[in-house]
């Protein structure tokens, strides 16, 4: 069961698997959640011990029964991992801790104007896990305003001491706030030299990349595939680092694949969740349980529901045996990866989906789309919202997209003449406008944030954020879409759709059912030729068929231009303007969301 509360003055007895240092019990809980085996923890605050070296210790614990004896101990704080919970989990920790110094390897010292600047420097430094900043009041003159960047092997401090007039905190890479380059390519027939910091077994290069991404020291990796000549190294994932942060040497090696950690990427692809099945493959590890079930999907579900299960192997039933039930072997290991991977065994293996909730919600796979047809089905575009105005009478005003649990991204031009957010209603999870009745629940708008350089749609900056009065609970029919990542600047999107309840032709009315149209992107040069009287800037993106026929139209404004890349949907554009609707050689013009990611993050994370 999910227990989120912390137990003050309680120590959990036994079950120790590791001890780390954390600045707070809350952070200890996050570390426990991300540790492959930790189910419970005990944190020792500064009042709990006479010995300062014991302050801020976070003891990670495991238990077969998922519980441990409780002992009264002043100053101790205990609790449970969030692995048992269904809510989203994030390693992001924006807290700044006053008068604490987190110890690590200090590898960079420089002056900074503020703790925030120091934290940003850490976030944008490939090696930095956490920092300490000496404030203007620090006793030592030469150390005032010094920003120390630090790293450790584990990503957690090697100790935490009280130190007056300093502040300390963590890198915000796990908050998807880094400006570092994000290299998503996986390079075939390539091995990287450089030092190995760890090695694990992985069934493919993408799982290897995900493991690298959430290993604190891994910057890039090399994976030896099943076809690798040296048998003992098959399926071996080597986690690597270097002083520069980049591989020093690329070696051509057949059947090896290499790539980079995605730690600095902004949202966009799942890094914890390994959802694939591996056929004719056995994952070896410590056995938790063996259960007879029907099919490998059922086996994965069983593993996901068993909190200590990390991966599984399903042995299909022999013909007409056991009512078609095969054996489901639930397994675990010290690091969450199989100890060995065997091929050609007839088994079907995979991982728990419990870790999927550590990824950004926007990366979750949605229902397969119905191809063809122009009417959407429920849950097909779960980020699409309908924005209504209640003045003078209630009507659909614009589309919009969920990008966070309190944020809708839409177009600035939608708010022409809108004097107050009080007249706005956001309806989420809606397929048909006819579903909206007097008593239909909606989200009120707390604030409208229009880009301060917006003047009119045709001159750009046609972007706005709506802050909702209450938060959205994500379900299959209402969830966010990923923002594009700076690292995706060179991606060529080929699967793009525009959606909305807008007109189907120039003189029409708002549609009842959410419409969809697959539309190809058009280069800005091509688009500029079609709109000689306008300036098509890099902050705009165009889409449309040369012959016309499919396009966004009145009422679609503010809605998404959604493009699928690497199995994840990205909000590439916001429906903005165009000449007529679906006219020949007049593509639709959309706000290029990629160019506004910093603006969006600045406003939503203020």
């Amino acid at each position: 069961e999910c227990v989120t509360r912390l137990f003050k003055d309680i120590h959990f007895e036994g079950g120790d698997i590791a001890t780390v240092f954390t600045p707070s019990a809350k952070h200890c809980q996050v570390v426990c959640t991300h540790h492959p085996r930790c189910l419970l923890f005990t944190f020792t605050g500064e009042s709990a011990s006479e010995d300062p070296t014991q302050w801020f210790t976070c003891v990670l614990k495991d238990s077969v029964t998922e519980t441990l004896p409780r002992v009264n101990r002043t100053g101790a704080i205990s609790g449970y991992s969030f692995k048992q919970c269904s809510h989203q989990i994030s390693a992001c920790n924006k807290d700044i801790y006053v008068d604490l110094n987190m110890k690590g390897i200090n590898y960079n010292s420089s002056l900074a104007e503020s703790a925030q600047e120091c934290q940003e420097r850490c976030t944008d430094d490939v090696h930095c896990h956490f920092f300490t900043y000496a404030t203007r009041q620090f006793p030592s003159l030469e150390h005032r305003n010094i920003c120390l960047l630090k790293h450790t092997q584990t990503g957690t401090p090697t100790g935490i001491m009280k130190l007056d007039k300093v502040v300390t905190g963590f890198s915000l890479k796990s908050c998807a706030l880094s400006n570092l380059a994000c290299i998503r390519d996986v390079f075939p027939n390539t091995a990287f030299a450089d030092s190995n910091i760890d090695s694990v077994m992985a069934p493919d290069a993408f799982v290897c990349r995900r493991i690298c991404t959430h290993h604190p020291g891994c910057l890039f990796f090399t994976f030896f595939s099943q076809e690798w000549p040296k048998e003992s190294q098959r399926n071996l994932c080597l986690l690597k680092t270097s002083e520069s942060g980049l591989p020093s040497t690329r070696i051509k090696k057949s059947k090896a694949l290499s790539g980079f950690s995605l730690q600095s990427c902004r949202h966009s692809i799942p890094v914890f969740c390994h959802s694939s099945f591996y056929h004719d493959t056995d994952f070896l590890g410590e056995e938790l349980d063996i259960v007879a079930v029907k099919g490998h999907e059922a086996c994965q579900k069983l593993c996901t529901n068993a909190v200590r299960c990390q991966f599984f192997t399903y042995a299909p039933a022999q013909a007409s045996c056991n009512e078609g039930k095969g054996k489901c072997y639930l397994k675990l290991s010290s690091n969450g990866s199989p100890t060995k991977i065997l091929r050609g065994t007839g088994g079907i293996s995979g991982y728990t989906l419990r870790l999927c909730k550590m990824d950004n919600e926007c990366t979750t796979k949605i229902k397969p789309r119905i191809v063809g047809g122009t009417a959407s089905v429920r849950g097909e575009w779960p980020w699409q919202v309908t924005l209504h105005t209640t003045s003078p009478t209630q009507r659909h005003l614009c589309g919009g997209s969920i990008i966070g649990n309190q944020w809708i991204l839409t177009a600035a031009h939608c708010f022409y003449g809108v004097e107050s957010p009080k007249i706005l209603r956001v309806y989420i999870g809606i397929l048909n406008q006819s579903e909206i009745k007097e008593d239909t629940s909606f989200f009120g708008v707390q604030e409208i944030i229009i880009h301060d350089q917006y003047k009119m749609a045709e001159s750009g900056y046609d972007i706005a954020l709506l802050k909702l009065e209450t938060t959205v609970n994500y379900t299959d029919s209402q969830r966010p879409i990923c923002l594009p990542s700076k690292g995706d600047r060179n991606v060529i999107y080929t699967d793009c759709w525009v959606t909305g309840w807008g007109y189907r032709k120039l003189r029409d009315k708002i549609q009842n059912t959410l419409q969809k149209a697959k539309i190809p992107l058009v280069t800005n040069d091509e688009c500029q030729k079609r709109y000689r009287g306008h300036k098509i800037t890099h902050k705009m993106i165009c889409a449309g068929y040369r012959e016309g026929g499919k396009d966004a139209c009145k009422g679609d404004s503010g809605g998404p231009l959604s493009c699928k890349h690497n199995e994840v949907w990205h909000l590439v554009g916001i429906t903005s303007w165009g000449e007529g609707c679906a006219q020949r050689e007049r593509p639709g013009v959309y706000t290029n969301v990629l160019e506004y990611v910093d603006w969006i993050l600045e406003k939503t994370q203020a």
Epitope: N106, L111, T132, P139, S140
Partner: antibody, heavy 124, light 107 residues
């Protein structure tokens, strides 16, 4: 062992400039600040300024502002102090001195290693 | 700037005797004070930092005390090699400033 070796004595005419070097060895050059202090004949010590060899940031005493420039070359672990528009009262022994260890935060420190000094004579 | 005043300007002491040197700051420098020893023709040498902490290799006969604006350097039993000029220096605010020095000479 840790040492700072300064360049040799200089004789300059008024209005000229002088550039004194200070080569560090035996420690990580970029991890400590470096101060420049001068001492006129028979006088006390006078602080001129400081440089952080890691980032190259500097802070100068108001008296020398506009006339002094402190630089560093991390490849040779050397700091330089250039004083321009020299006048006779700039005749002094110029010292470089190692300051705080900047890779760790602690409250108190002093200038723990000094160069041998460079005599600069300004005379027409 | 913070003005550092040392007294006396000259102190005549016999070997084996105790010497007490004083340093006053024009405003509080907390414990951000260092003491140096300088012999003729040589560079200064750090004795004490943080008002009372002896630098590496400095004999125990040297001790520092005080905080705020009043500081003292004590040499418990003067040795022949201790006859020199002693400077105090504040590290509390830019610009760093030195006292005028106290010359300890043989009585």
């Amino acid at each position: 062992q840790v040492q700072l070796v300064q360049s040799g004595a200089e004789v300059k005419k008024p209005g000229a400039s002088v550039k004194v070097s200070c080569k560090a060895s035996g420690y990580t050059f970029t991890s400590y600040s470096m101060h420049w202090v001068r001492q006129a004949p028979g006088q006390g010590l006078e602080w001129m300024g400081i440089i952080n060899p890691s980032g190259g940031s500097t802070s100068y005493a108001q008296k020398f502002q506009g006339r002094v420039t402190m630089t560093r070359d991390t490849s040779t672990s050397t700091v330089y102090m250039e004083l321009s528009s020299l006048r006779s009262e700039d005749t002094a022994v110029y010292y470089c001195a190692r300051g705080a260890y900047l890779m760790e935060l602690y409250y108190y420190y002093g200038m723990d290693v000094w160069g041998q000094g460079t005599t600069v004579t300004v005379s027409s | 700037e913070i003005v550092m005043t040392q007294s006396p300007a000259t102190l005549s002491v016999s070997p084996g005797e105790r010497a007490t040197l004083s340093c006053r700051a024009s405003q509080s420098v907390s414990s951000n004070l260092a003491w140096y020893q300088q012999k003729p023709g040589q560079a200064p040498r750090l004795l004490i930092y943080g008002a009372s902490t002896r630098a590496t290799g400095i004999p125990a006969r040297f001790s520092g005390s005080g905080s705020g604006t009043e500081f003292t350097l004590t040499i418990s039993s003067l040795q022949s090699e201790d006859f020199a000029v002693y400077y105090c220096q504040q590290f509390n605010d830019w610009p760093l400033t030195f006292g005028g020095g106290t010359k300890v000479e043989i009585k």
